[in-house]
Interface confidence: medium
Amino acid sequence: TTPEPCELDDEDFRCVCNFSEPQPDWSEAFQCVSAVEVEIHAGGLNLEPFLKRVDADADPRQYADTVKALRVRRLTVGAAQVPAQLLVGALRVLAYSRLKELTLEDLKITGTMPPLPLEATGLALSSLRLRNVSWATGRSWLAELQQWLKPGLKVLSIAQAHSPAFSCEQVRAFPALTSLDLSDNPGLGERGLMAALCPHKFPAIQNLALRNTGMETPTGVCAALAAAGVQPHSLDLSHNSLRATVNPSAPRCMWSSALNSLNLSFAGLEQVPKGLPAKLRVLDLSCNRLNRAPQPDELPEVDNLTLDGNPFLVPGTALPHEGSMNSGVVPAC
């Protein structure tokens, strides 16, 4: 006997559906109506035939009361080929829900997204997370998707993007976006970062995560941020192969005074990089290849310094920097 495709936990909180049959019984997903977190994985299916069974142009207001009653706050949809028209139909209906976080992963979006009708209301998401989503429209995908969202988006995460650079002239500003996570786009690089950080479109960014994005030097990142007018409070550059030295011909970059937390862990550093901000509240240099304790003149003025997991540190040695937060135990790096 084949297992049930959908499982709802005992608290009616989380519901996970894995539709792996070639012709799945989608009605099984109805048992998720009472859940707060819903995950639907479509087993790589092409949902094109779905368009014949649903009227994507129907007025979603007819479903408003039903959708408003749903408890769902977090929705994950994964592993499918989805016509843009179907995605738009779903977004129009979900606009009446209390959905706060939408995650799309391992999806191939085919066709173009139509413009938002005048009478339609956008989806009031707090968080949008995309992982390995490809769009037929190339660089304009963010602008197309953005028009279906209300302007209150706070968190945007884009990983394994097929086109991490956006068509900046088409993108509207994200006035409320405080956290942007572009991690796990190893082909991005510093030039790609400049293209992705559309100038003046992210005025409220406080947290920027760039883990595993092909960044080369902190100075190069500084230049990209300065060009875009992005001034994060917290910057995560961990899991990049960073060079400690700066190209002598490159112009010096002044970091924004807003930056107070910098994560340079797992960056393969053999020495403290040049060109760091002069003052930081938090600096994480853990799990690098530092063979000696950094000298005070190599470091920014920093309140909390983490150096755990570097070769020079042996459990039980004295803390190498006043105010540092080393545990004395070498972590599994």
Epitope: R73, S126, V155, Q206, A209
Partner: nanobody
Framework: QVQLQESGGGLVQSGGSLRLSCAVS????????MGWYRQAPGKGRELVAE??????NYADSVLGRFTISRDNAKNTVYLQMNSLKPEDTAVYYC?????????????????WGQGTQVTVSS
């Protein structure tokens, strides 16, 4: 740990007023929505009022009688309840949607208070 602390509930005569407060404490990064829900005996939890990005939303049954407001500096949301009716009797819960805390700024988080009892006698 992020916590919500409600206060202001109690016993009031029909037609009277109460003001509920809900303070968010802990390592908050960014509050998106704050709202009030209620649960009457034997019934499900229902939305009373919420403050979302740039807009307010009320249940039809409280429109014109209840007002939700927020003090961003104090991370506190209020519910001013006027012209109270016996059918408003319930436990009132505060709810906050946070996009991240200082230790995890890239996650959405939902937090509920313990609830405060409101009883309206006829």
């Amino acid at each position: 740990q992020v916590q919500l602390q409600e206060s202001g509930g109690g016993l009031v005569q029909s037609g009277g007023s109460l003001r509920l407060s809900c303070a968010v404490s802990g390592s908050i990064f960014s509050i998106v929505d704050m709202g009030w829900y209620r649960q009457a005996p034997g019934k499900g939890r229902e939305l009373v009022a919420e403050l979302s990005y740039g807009s307010t939303n009320y249940a039809d049954s409280v429109l014109g009688r209840f007002t939700i407001s927020r003090d961003n500096a104090k991370n506190t949301v209020y519910l001013q309840m006027n012209s109270l009716k016996p059918e408003d009797t319930a436990v009132y819960y505060c709810n906050a949607d946070l996009t991240g805390t200082s230790w995890s700024p890239y996650r959405y988080l939902e937090v509920w208070g313990q609830g405060t009892q409101v009883t309206v006698s006829s």
